[in-house]
Interface confidence: low
């Protein structure tokens, strides 16, 4: 189990998300050229893409990927069964839900099949690499003459996600943003009925079930209020 | 048996203070009474002197430590007793097994300030005081604005269902004096209640520029 260790007052010890180990570099032969770094993301805990920059190779090379889970029941080395390609060269691997074990150390190994000594291993904490789908079904409820409540849904365990709400009016230069915990609702307690408001939300797998840094895509925006009748330079910049 | 109706209510501020109110019909005003706190799993105990706040009610604050120290958790149970002196002896008037994180009332928000004011809007910020780190972001707020010619009781409540320590008040009248208050509540606790209202913050909107509608 890979964990973030916290002392009782909430101070975190630093933990790294991956480790790179390459073969020793005595001379710069092909076998000692560094392999590209593998980047993995777990999409909504439905599938995982592990990708690398295939164009960083000196010549087009179909690198192979193996993976396993360290110190667990799933520690048997597995071959990638579903490669992703970039211009007919392997550039990634897709793993399906049944192959994803969020709370075990995921070990990924990239290898040059023509130079078997040329390999690099990384250890990843998958719970820190989850990217949820964008929030859906944004709805606005009028609580009173001047108050709005924004609600949304996520296709995931709600308590695992935190959210970022952004809103702006047709008179604003920039978005106003506010973080929201797992409750997936946001109150705007004072609105101006003469302005048109736009809201959008994104979500992140943090902090209760993981420590992911990456946010989901933004939701589709939702609007409220009337278009301002006054001439307004920002009116058409809402989606910028 | 204790004569008359007795009511003993206490709240924990989530850090190092338990505030109690005891009311007793027909109690003697000049009786000396105390609240004793005995936690079930801590080495300390604490006492405070009940002081009259009305004809038949007394209040006191149990100071458990420095203001920001975390003295209790959700597994603690504190036995609270009201003890009154009767001659040379102490008599127990009320008792309760107090679960601190089921009976929360935070301190009123502090440091209210105007961040930015215009003719029709005003941005105000505040800070929470002595709130446990256990809450993380699991807090909500209510706010109200006092307009000229109205009372606080008439002011509509504004709800913030998220931990947001600022507000942008819209549709204000230019060149007008307002007051603003905010209060806070944790999500946790069956008997948890709102904090007292903050000290009011007075502010004035900017006057409208002549010949312009801002």
């Amino acid at each position: 189990l890979n964990t973030t260790i916290l002392t009782p007052n909430g101070n975190e010890d630093a933990t790294t998300d991956f480790f790179l180990t390459s073969m020793p570099t005595d001379s710069l032969s092909v076998s000692t050229l560094p392999l590209p770094e593998v980047q993995c993301f777990v999409f909504n805990v439905e599938y995982m893409n592990c990708t690398w920059n295939s164009s960083s190779e000196p010549q087009p090379t179909n690198l192979t990927l193996h993976y396993w889970y360290k110190n667990s029941d799933n520690d048997k080395v597995q071959k990638c069964s579903h490669y992703l390609f970039s211009e007919e060269i392997t550039s990634g691997c897709q793993l399906q839900k049944k192959e994803i074990h969020l709370y075990q150390t995921f070990v990924v190994q990239l290898q040059d099949p023509r130079e078997p000594r040329r390999q690099a291993t990384q250890m990843l904490k998958l719970q820190n690499l989850v990217i949820p789908w964008a929030p859906e079904n944004l709805t606005l409820r009028k609580l009173s003459e001047s108050q709005l409540e924004l609600n949304w849904n996520n296709r995931f365990l709600n308590h695992c996600l935190e959210h970022l709400v952004q809103y702006r009016t047709d008179w604003d230069h920039s978005w106003t943003e506010q973080s929201v915990d797992y409750r997936h609702k946001f109150s705007l307690p004072s609105v101006d009925g003469q302005k048109r408001y736009t809201f959008r939300v994104r979500s992140r797998f943090n902090p209760l079930c993981g420590s992911a840094q990456h946010w989901s895509e933004w939701s589709h925006p939702i609007h409220w209020g009337s278009n301002s009748s006054k001439e307004n330079p920002f009116l058409f910049a809402l989606e910028a | 048996a204790v004569n008359g109706t007795s009511r003993f209510t206490c709240f924990y501020n989530s850090r190092a203070n338990i505030s109690c109110v005891w009311s007793q019909d027909g109690a003697l005003q000049d009786t000396s009474c105390q609240v004793h706190a005995w936690p079930d799993r801590r080495r300390w105990n604490q006492t405070c002197e009940l002081l009259p706040v009305s004809q038949a009610s007394w209040a006191c604050n149990l100071i458990l430590g420095t203001p920001d120290s975390q003295k209790l958790t959700a597994v603690d149970i504190v036995t609270l007793r009201v003890m009154c002196r009767e001659g040379v002896r102490w008599r127990m008037m009320a008792i309760q097994d107090f679960k601190p994180f089921e009976n929360l009332r935070l301190m009123a928000p502090i440091s209210l300030q105007v961040v930015h004011v215009e003719t029709h809007r005003c941005n105000i910020s505040w800070k929470i005081s002595q709130a446990s780190h256990y809450f993380e972001r699991h807090l909500e707020f209510e706010a109200r604005t006092l307009s000229p010619g109205h009372t606080w009781e008439e002011a509509p409540l504004m709800t913030l269902k998220q931990k947001q320590e600022w507000i942008c008040l819209e549709t204000l009248t230019p060149d007008t004096q307002y007051e603003f208050q905010v209060r806070v509540k944790p999500l946790q606790g069956e008997f948890t209640t709102w904090s007292p209202w903050s000290q009011p913050l007075a502010f004035r909107t900017k006057p409208a520029a002549l010949g312009k509608d801002t």
Partner: nanobody, 119 residues
């Protein structure tokens, strides 16, 4: 109703190991943070360790860090505490407690299991 039953305690020599278990029932186990807390003879309650509902975030008291490992099996509604390099000062009644996202030390706890570390 909520029930937490600890087991696995006993007498062990200094430097030895024990594994405590906690069987939970009466609530949706994988919705809750869980903790281990302990009480040494004649002393106050000491919080030992805490694990989030999914097992992704773990807290340890400084006194046990590096020696104790908390884990959970949500499928079997079970919480575990693996204890290595036990010392005399680890002698205590160990309780399993149900927590939540707000208060890590919980709202319900079991009857406890006694761990005695002595030569």
């Amino acid at each position: 109703q909520v029930q937490l039953v600890e087991s696995g305690g006993g007498l062990v020599k200094p430097g030895g190991s024990l594994r405590l278990s906690c069987a939970a029932s009466g609530f949706t186990f994988n919705d809750y943070y869980m903790s281990w807390i302990r009480q040494a003879p004649g002393k106050g309650l000491e919080w030992v360790s805490h694990i989030s509902s999914s097992g992704s975030t773990i807290y340890y008291a400084d006194s046990v860090k590096g020696r104790f490992t908390v884990s959970r099996d949500n499928a079997n509604n079970s919480l575990y505490l693996q204890m290595h390099s036990l010392r005399a000062e680890d002698t205590a009644v160990y309780y399993c407690a149900r927590g939540d996202a707000v208060s890590i030390t919980g709202d319900y706890r079991g009857q406890g299991t006694l761990v005695t570390v002595s030569s």
